[in-house]
């Protein structure tokens, strides 16, 4: 009798659909060739196939096999009219797998899946599961046709870890999942607000974000021009505001504010604010006249143009009188006093058109 | 048309066992995840065992956790639901449901289990 | 688990009236995964709504459906005879599935 062929190999490439049959020769000398068959098994519907190779081979390739379905492959030595008993094994070549998933289009209530549909004519279509992190049973699923490669997710909590899964379908079988693990965005806060601008405090608001327990809100402030000075506060989920303090007067500073939920963060709601200037400090006078004084000051932190000194009789309701001086000088000597009066001066440190408030002193001639 | 039609239910002693079937037709049922939902006389409904399309993943209420089994046979487009060691508290009418999560979206009439001495 | 309490236990009311069922959930479960199914006697439950709000084929609309969080409604704008029946919510969200324990409707 001949002798079968030996050490059958099969292997299966979902993603093209090929089976590689590969066996070691018979040892009867001077054989035809072999003849390898694939056959469904149990009566299963699908191509029997046959293929006849000289036999200096020993591998053949089938296409076309029905992915998902049992397949008997045998390969008989052949000589002349005569066939050898088969060297036989199944294989089930499997239902190909979407390799390329990705998400797109994250936001708090929903995740976009992408992929590229498998071009294999017995795919019917797909599967789509999500399972919240901590549950067992899948909380969503739908299907899709076999062209779809686009699929959005809504209706998902923010902040939550989802395993997503697309599972290609064929008639009667399906892939392994492809799974990947998401979280949905955690949402930001709304409405930046800024009140009660001092020269060196500021109250933040906003309003927080609904259907949510957050863990906290992170605030975090810097002035505009030095960014890399950045302050931060964690205030509690039920807190909606903070009063930022010791700021640099005259200063804009960029604030944003985000939610945390666990360890993620939102998209930071920004917003830019700045600080008022100011007061001049420390007023004083000397060389006092009959009628005339010298004032001094010292000038504020802010950046500034110039003051403005006003300077009027204390029970006086008239019109004060009014001197600008540059930012560069902190004193002006004013004239043309009343002997033996009280006067008020008051001292405005200005910045263009903005203005710090009152440095107010008295002082007689 | 979507019909769903359950079997193998009867009176049974408490301990003993049981198998239910469940035939499906009018989809592609090895496309569906399935279910066993139950409702004792005169109660609400309970869901008591889902198993996913392929039969690969399998999910119990703790109530029935190590005495029940889902299994189906895609084939043959039937759900099964075998139940061992039945106690008294088991007895209800049991329905088996498509479950397309997150909801059951079509049922059966249901089939009557008594486990009584 | 998620446990889902109905009320009011039984509603008695005549046909054209209108009927509020409501469902209460012991944690937040989002409308996404909230359902309600109707069953007659000697019947299999059938499904009314899914995603909280939305009609599910073949109901009519004097069904709606409405809440978010942890309260939900079902309503019947004008019960007609053949709604008399036992009304269940369910929730997905959470393993297990888990149902209210209905709320009977009957006839006055």
């Known amino acids: 009798p001949l002798s079968p062929p030996t050490n059958l190999h099969l292997e299966a490439n979902p993603d093209t659909g090929v089976l590689t049959v590969s066996w070691e020769r018979s040892t009867t000398p001077d054989i035809t060739g072999y003849r390898i068959t694939t056959t469904p098994t149990n009566g299963q519907q699908g191509n029997s196939l046959e293929e006849v190779v000289h036999a200096d081979q020993s591998s053949c390739t089938f296409d076309n096999l029905s992915p998902g379905l049992e397949y008997n492959v045998s390969v008989y030595t052949v000589k002349d009219d005569k066939e050898s008993v088969p060297i036989s094994d199944t294989i089930i070549p499997e239902v190909p797998q979407l390799t390329d998933l990705s998400f797109v289009d994250i936001t708090d209530s929903s995740i976009g899946l992408r992929w590229t549909p498998l071009n294999s004519s017995t795919i019917i279509g797909y599967r789509i599961t999500v399972v919240a992190a901590g549950e067992g049973i899948p909380i969503f699923e739908d299907f899709v046709d076999s062209s779809v490669g686009y699929y959005t997710v809504t209706g998902l909590e923010p902040g939550i870890d989802y395993d997503i899964s697309v599972i290609t379908l064929i008639n009667g079988g399906e892939s392994a999942p492809t799974t990947l693990t998401q979280q949905t965005a955690v949402p930001p806060p709304t409405d930046l607000r800024f009140t009660n601008i001092g020269p060196d405090t500021m109250r933040v608001t906003w309003a927080p974000p609904p259907s949510i327990d957050l863990t906290n809100f992170l605030v975090r402030y810097s002035p505009v021009k030095n960014e890399e000075d950045v302050a931060e506060l964690s205030i509690s989920p039920s807190d909606n505001a903070v009063v930022l303090t010791n700021l640099l007067p005259g200063t804009e500073y960029v604030v944003s504010v985000s939610s945390v939920y666990e360890q993620h963060e939102s998209t930071p709601l920004r917003g830019r604010q700045k600080t008022g200037l100011d007061s001049p400090t420390g007023i004083d006078f000397s060389d006092i006249t009959a009628n005339s004084f010298t004032v001094h000051w010292i000038a504020p932190r802010a950046t500034i143009t110039g003051y403005r000194i006003r300077h009027h009789p204390e029970h006086f309701s008239g019109r004060p009188r009014e001197d600008r001086v540059p930012h560069s000088r902190n004193s002006i000597t004013l004239t043309n006093l009343t002997p033996g009066t009280e006067y008020v001066v008051s001292i405005v440190a200005l910045n263009g058109r903005e203005e710090s408030p009152l440095l107010i002193g008295q002082q007689s001639t | 048309e979507v019909q769903l039609l359950e079997s193998g239910g009867g009176l049974v002693q408490p301990g003993g066992s049981l198998r239910l079937s469940c035939a499906a037709s009018?989809?592609?049922?090895?496309?569906?995840?399935m279910s066993w939902v139950r409702q004792a006389p005169g109660k609400g409904l309970e869901w008591v065992s889902r198993i996913s399309p392929s039969g690969s993943s399998t999910y119990y209420a703790d109530s029935v956790k190590g005495r029940f089994t889902i299994s189906r046979d895609n084939s043959k487009n039937t759900l099964y639901l075998q139940m061992n060691s039945l106690r008294a508290e088991d007895t209800a009418v049991y329905y088996c449901a498509r479950h397309t999560a997150p909801l059951f979206d079509y049922w059966g009439q249901g089939t009557l289990v008594t486990v009584s001495s | 688990e998620i446990v889902l309490t109905q009320s009011p236990g039984t509603l008695s009311l005549s046909p054209g009236e209108r009927a509020t069922l409501s469902c209460r959930a012991s944690?937040?479960?989002?409308?996404?995964?909230l359902a309600w199914y109707q069953q007659k006697p000697g019947q299999a439950p059938r499904l009314l709504i899914y995603?909280?709000?939305n009609l599910a084929t073949g109901i009519p609309d004097r069904f709606s459906g409405s809440g978010s969080g942890t309260d939900f409604t079902l309503t019947i704008s004008r019960l007609e005879p053949e709604d008399f029946a036992v009304y269940y919510c369910q929730q997905g969200r959470h393993t297990p599935p888990t149902f209210g324990q209905g709320t009977k409707v009957e006839i006055k």
């Open positions: 995603k909280a709000s």
């Open positions: 009018g989809f592609t049922f090895s496309s569906y995840a």
């Open positions: 944690q937040s479960v989002s409308s996404s995964y």
